[in-house]
């Protein structure tokens, strides 16, 4: 059996080397001479030769200083043989533990740590964490037990101890009130990590703390009084630029200005913010009326995009806006005039009078009237009075010029101001219907097949309006009923079904169809009918030789 005491060896030993560690014995040495050898890491495998054994005495020796941080434990095997080379023991595992010396100082994981904290943060607020590591043994010794401290703070304002560090975790926290970005936007701390719980080897790093902005400064008008002028009637015109300063961080919501007009109930003005320099741009939101009011005194307040973090006074400015008089166009009253008139209204008669008012009450001006748009050339106007008459017959069914029974004309009124100003009025003639159109069939050209012909639907169209339209009456005339029949397709009698009474030869036929509206206005229309060489529904008509007869019925 082996006799091997526990083996440990301190790192960084001075020597001299080789140095005895322990004496290994096999109790087989009582039976005869025993020779010892070792194998394994540090003996015959890299790093080779760190450990040796005296062949005859069994003294295990170390040949050089050890480094625990490189290899903390060596695993060797001891061997014992007799003089003839035969093994007298099974190999035995030997563990050599390298004991730690405090030969490594802590190392911060970064040279510079960066953190941030809001200005005005309460004491106790965690800011950031610094971390250091130590290669020494932290299980059996305090050689890697790191304690953190703050060595210095720059600037030492408003207090030399604005921050504290948790000596165990490296968490940096606020300890003193008074962080103010506008006064001290950054702090640089020199932090120390020392092993042996703060009493041993040490190293330093830098913690840079950025104090982030809160909205603790109001925007302030400078100056607080402004003057501007604007022509009447013009919207979106810049009147003046308002200037503010804000000590908070530029281009952040705590700096960006929001302007509010305190006494603009009519919503006549608007202040927008110039995103580049925070100026307030005062503009007209709608046209102002010189005749109603010649001067406005506006009170403008300025705040930020985000609310104030603390109780702050809101800055206000006074803006005096003078409205400038401008020659304004005459205004038609009403701007759109509707007149009902029958489409058979007599030519040369006055339909209506359409006049404009002069808004410039401070100027005496004469108004002249002209027709600006009259696409059908139906109207004329008296330039002095604005009386409008017909110059040609009206026609409700002129669908090129009349939409939904309405004819639209534009009238202009021009004053003699400087410069001349022109106003426009819209005249809507609502044309009432006269029964001046008879019904007509649609389509007028019809195709049938020679064999088994499919009846064809014919729609009845009347350009007039009810009651001058359906129900319609249809009748075949001039002997057409001999070969053809018609019947109403629906109760409104707005369409009919035409079909031949008998088999017809291929060829072209003309059918006279009399249509009459509800007011008995009638008209005879000739239908062009082709009988084709086909069966059923007529598609593309392949005609046979045309029938010689002129009018076939």
């Amino acid at each position: 059996d082996w006799v091997i005491p526990p083996i440990s060896c301190p790192e960084n030993e001075k020597g001299p080397f080789p140095k005895n560690l322990v004496q290994i014995k096999s109790n087989k040495d009582k039976e005869g001479k025993v020779f010892y050898s070792i194998t394994g890491q540090g003996a015959d495998t890299p790093p080779v030769g760190v450990f040796i054994i005296e062949r005859e005495t069994g003294w295990l020796k170390v040949t050089e200083p050890l480094d625990r941080e490189r290899i903390a434990t060596y695993t060797l095997f001891s061997h014992a043989v007799s003089s003839n080379g035969n093994a007298v023991e099974d190999p035995m595992e030997i563990l050599i533990t390298v004991t730690d010396q405090n030969d490594n100082k802590p190392e911060f994981t970064q040279e510079v740590f960066k953190g941030s904290v809001m200005e005005g943060a309460l004491p106790g607020t965690s800011v950031m964490e610094v971390t250091a590591t130590d290669a020494d043994d932290d299980v059996n010794t305090y050689n890697a037990a790191i304690a953190y401290t703050i060595l210095s703070q720059d600037p030492e304002l408003p207090d030399k101890n604005m921050f504290t560090i948790n000596r165990n975790t490296g968490v940096i926290s606020v300890v003193t009130t008074g962080l103010d970005r506008e006064s001290f936007p950054t702090y640089t701390l020199v932090v120390q990590a020392a092993d042996l719980q703060g009493e041993g080897l040490s190293t330093t790093a830098t913690a840079v703390i950025t104090v982030t902005d809160t909205n603790d400064n109001p925007p302030i008008f400078n100056p607080t009084t402004y003057k501007g002028q604007v022509p009447e009637n013009e919207a979106n015109v810049v009147i003046t630029t308002l200037k503010v300063t804000d000590a908070d961080a530029p281009n952040t919501p705590a700096w960006e200005a929001v302007y509010t007009i305190l006494n603009d109930d009519g919503g006549q003005f608007v202040v927008t913010t110039n995103p580049v320099n925070n100026d307030g741009i005062l503009k007209t939101a709608k046209g102002l009326d010189f005749e109603a009011k010649q001067q406005y005194i506006l009170h403008v307040a300025v705040t930020n995009v985000v609310p104030f973090e603390v109780s702050l006074t809101t800055s206000t400015a006074t803006v005096t806006v003078d409205v400038l008089d401008v020659n304004e166009a005459p205004i038609f009253v009403p701007p759109e005039k509707r007149v009902e008139v029958s489409e058979d209204f007599g030519v040369g008669q006055e339909i209506t009078s359409y006049t404009a008012q002069e808004p410039d009450t401070f100027m005496e001006q004469k108004i002249t009237y002209r027709i600006w748009r009259d696409t059908a050339n139906w109207l004329e106007i008296n330039p002095d009075t604005g009386a409008i008459s017909t110059r040609a017959e009206l026609d409700r069914e002129d669908f090129e010029h009349v939409k939904n029974s309405t004819y639209t004309a534009l009238i202009i009124a021009t004053d003699n101001g400087s410069p001349v100003a022109t106003g426009t009025g819209t005249l809507l003639l609502i044309l009432s219907d006269v029964n001046d159109n008879a019904p007509i069939p649609e389509p007028r050209t019809i195709f049938f097949c020679e064999r088994n012909p499919k009846p064809q639907v014919i729609n009845i169209i009347d350009a007039d309006l009810p009651p001058n339209t359906s129900p319609f009456t249809a009748e075949l005339t001039h002997g057409a009923s001999a070969n053809w029949t018609i019947q109403y397709n629906d109760p409104t009698q707005e369409s009919i079904i035409l079909k031949p009474k008998m088999a017809l030869e291929v060829g072209d036929y003309k059918i006279n169809l009399k249509l009459m509206d509800n007011q008995n206005k009638d008209q005879v229309t000739t239908l062009e009918v082709s009988v084709c060489d086909c069966e059923g529904a007529a598609g593309v008509c392949r005609k046979a030789q045309p029938v010689e007869a002129g009018l076939q019925i």
Epitope: L122, G124, T164, N168, T177, E309, V310
Partner: antibody, heavy 117, light 111 residues
Framework: EVQLLESGGGLVQPGGSLRLSCAAS????????MSWVRQAPGKGLEWVSA????????YYADSVKGRFTISRDNSKNTLYLQMNSLRAEDTAVYYC??????????WGQGTMVTVSS | QSALTQPASVSGSPGQSITISCTGT?????????VSWYQQHPGKAPKLMIS???KRPSGVSNRFSGSKSGNTASLTISGLQAEDEADYYC???????????FGGGTKLTVL
């Protein structure tokens, strides 16, 4: 000499409200965080609420969160504690205290708040 | 339950020395050198006796001293006098909120 003087305590029914004030003198009020600490009869000290020097940051103990509001008027050198929805367990002497150098110092003389029906 | 642990009571005769302990954690007492001790007489407000572990404010007798080892802080009063009879509270700065935690208080009786 730094001085703090509380007022506003009294008897109030459960569910009622009170507003405590703390008038400060002898130091630059706006430069210091302030706290309210309470002490129930025969009990220890309990931190209630705190506010930063500017008034921009506030803290409340869980036991009063949503019911109490701390504020300050730096122009009047006065700290306030608005107490709503008061409960019997809010019965205590309420102290205001100045925070500096990692500690609360000095303390006011205290004002008694009794919540009882 | 208080965050810091103090003995409920201690006593001593005039002229003797007594020590009051205050045990916290590695996140408060053990982490920062911001341990304070307050004296409170019945019906009065707390008065700061020791700040930053061992600093005495002006006007506080040098019979009062403070120390700290690991997670435990101590207040020692030497040459005990009758007027020292009071409740004593320890407090410590702590990261996060609240910024300060209190002990449950120790009643000192001068025999």
């Amino acid at each position: 000499e730094v001085q703090l003087l509380e007022s506003g305590g009294g008897l109030v029914q459960p569910g009622g409200s009170l507003r405590l004030s703390c008038a400060a003198s002898g130091f630059t009020f706006s430069s210091y965080a302030m706290s309210w600490v309470r002490q129930a009869p025969g009990k220890g000290l309990e931190w209630v609420s705190a506010i930063s020097g500017s008034g921009g940051s506030t803290y409340y103990a869980d036991s009063v969160k949503g019911r109490f509001t701390i504020s300050r008027d730096n122009s009047k050198n006065t700290l306030y504690l608005q107490m709503n929805s008061l409960r019997a367990e809010d019965t205590a002497v309420y102290y205001c205290a100045k925070w500096g150098d990692g500690t609360l110092n000095p303390w006011g003389q205290g004002t008694m708040v009794t919540v009882s029906s | 339950q208080s965050a810091l642990t103090q003995p409920a009571s201690v006593s001593g005769s005039p002229g003797q020395s007594i020590t009051i302990s205050c045990t916290g954690t590695s996140n408060d007492v053990g982490a920062y050198n911001y341990v304070s001790w307050y004296q409170q007489h019945p019906g009065k407000a707390p008065k700061l006796m020791i700040s930053e572990v061992n600093k005495r404010p002006s006007g506080v007798s040098n019979r009062f001293s403070g120390s700290k080892s690991g997670n435990t802080a101590s207040l020692t009063i030497s040459g005990l006098q009758a007027e020292d009879e009071a409740d004593y509270y320890c407090s410590s700065f702590t990261s996060g909120l609240p910024w300060v935690v209190f002990g449950g208080g120790t009643k000192l009786t001068v025999l």
